[in-house]
Interface confidence: medium
């Protein structure tokens, strides 16, 4: 077993809905008995080695578990001794122990069960940022931006929604932000504006609420 080594973090923590890159290097002897290409898979601990599908694999013929399909990706090339794992749209039920297996047909060569990865998916604690450029002046259009700069680009793009008693508005969005264009009225002063961000890949929603401070230009009549 000394010829088989896997170097990776013992424990990785990620908040739900977000992404994490797990660096990993894998070493195995050059055994001539296995003439096929080297493929690798990450499997969840507790599954039967032969009867359960992996969570991520470099073998295009092998099925992966539906629960992790498209979210867990073996980024590295095991033939180049790279077993790096990328997880997007992390879900609470992804929490668990994982191990790497290297395969070279026709025989399964080795499962690195002595170097298991402990994955912890915690509640999403971060909240969106709402950015107001300058002051809100009654009767003048303004752009409010709700952003989640901490979201990862590779994840499922979040869904933004705005809630307010303010008047009708227009919103546009990018991958990690949404711009709300609206013209505040004097009566909007003191009302609340909420930006909700839903990470559908993990089924989690976070929000940020602000209180509008609407100013008047001198000469405007107070109602």
């Amino acid at each position: 077993d000394l010829e088989f080594q896997l170097v990776a973090p013992e424990s990785v923590t990620v908040e739900e809905g977000l992404c994490v890159h797990v660096p990993c290097s894998v070493f195995y002897p050059s055994i001539k008995l296995t003439l096929g290409p080297v493929t690798g898979s990450w499997l969840r601990k507790g599954v039967s080695l032969h009867e359960d599908s992996p969570v991520a694999t470099s073998d295009p013929r092998q099925l992966v578990q539906k629960a992790t399909q498209g979210r867990f990706q073996l980024l590295g090339d095991p033939q180049k001794h790279d077993c790096s794992l990328f997880i997007r749209d992390a879900q609470k039920n992804d929490t668990g122990m994982y191990f790497f297996r290297v395969v070279r047909e026709p025989f399964v060569r080795y499962s690195y069960k002595k170097s298991q990865l402990s994955l912890h998916v915690t509640s999403l604690s971060r909240t969106p940022d709402i950015i107001i450029p300058g002051t809100l002046e009654a009767g003048y259009p303004s752009n409010l931006t709700c952003s989640v700069p901490w979201a990862c680009e590779q994840g499922t793009p979040p869904t933004f929604s705005w809630m307010s008693t303010a008047l009708t508005s227009l919103s546009s969005r990018t991958t990690d932000s949404s711009v709300l264009t609206f013209t505040p009225q004097p009566q909007d002063h003191g009302t609340k504006l909420t930006c909700l961000v839903t990470f559908s890949g993990a089924g989690v929603t976070v929000e940020r609420t602000i209180q509008l401070n609407v100013t008047r230009k001198s000469g405007q009549m107070r109602e």
């Epitope: 010829e3 002897p29 055994i31 001539k32 008995l33 003439l35 096929g36 080695l49 032969h50 009867e51 013929r61 047909e105 026709p106 025989f107 399964v108 060569r109 080795y110």
Partner: antibody, heavy 118, light 107 residues
């Protein structure tokens, strides 16, 4: 319980053909590499051929290369060995064997005798 | 091809004896070696794999050691059911090869 049951052995003349079958049960057949290993009367063990779980990879001993073909039908949980151009030295008990990993054989069938004689 | 040479070819021993069988590979095979037991008219049975790992269900009186080219199978206290022929097998390179066998007989 893992079971491997060979069939298809018998007496055949030199130059003739024979097809051996191995019916597997008690495990997920498609997940395992399977081999044929033979044993001439009163002699030791000789590995003949192996096929990967998917059937995509096959390997043969030089003594049978070009004459024998290993195959499998995962839908029927069955392993095959097609033996052509048989020679007297192919006379042996033929075992099918399951490989858990690493090129070892953890379960074997009871064997089927192939006799090549005129 | 990797040649596997077993010695002795036969050994006479009594119940309770400690029996040692050696297997030598013609080139280094790391720990890619298995040991099998075969009784007359029966299929071989896997005892040891990866040179020293005991197959599930095999009595602990069987043990394996070695690495590289020299390997040993030891039966610490021979039992009546242990009288059989033992084979080593390398799983390092194609073609997979077996040793010639060692017959353990009753003294």
């Amino acid at each position: 319980e893992v079971q491997l049951l060979e069939s298809g052995g018998g007496l055949v003349q030199p130059g003739g053909s024979l097809r051996l079958s191995c019916a597997a049960s008690g495990f997920t057949f498609s997940s395992y590499a399977m081999s044929w290993v033979r044993q001439a009367p009163g002699k030791g063990l000789e590995w003949v051929s192996v096929i990967s779980g998917s059937g995509g990879s096959t390997y043969y001993a030089d003594s049978v290369k070009g004459r024998f073909t290993i195959s499998r039908d995962n839908s029927k949980n069955t392993l095959y060995l097609q033996m052509n151009s048989l020679r007297a030295e192919d006379t042996a008990v033929y075992y099918c064997a399951k490989s858990p990993s690493d090129g070892y054989f953890d379960y074997w069938g009871q064997g089927t005798l192939v006799t090549v004689s005129s | 091809d990797i040649q596997m040479t077993q010695s002795p070819s036969s050994v006479s021993a009594s119940v309770g004896d400690r029996v040692t069988i050696t297997c030598r590979a013609s080139q280094g095979i790391s720990s890619w070696l298995a040991w099998y037991q075969q009784k007359p008219g029966k299929a071989p049975k896997l005892l040891i794999y990866a040179a020293s790992s005991l197959q599930s269900g095999v009595p602990s009186r069987f043990s394996g050691s070695g690495s590289g080219t020299d390997f040993t199978l030891t039966i610490s206290s021979l039992q009546p059911e242990d009288f059989a022929t033992y084979y080593c097998q390398q799983a390092f390179d194609f073609p997979i090869t077996f040793g010639g066998g060692t017959k353990v007989e009753i003294k």
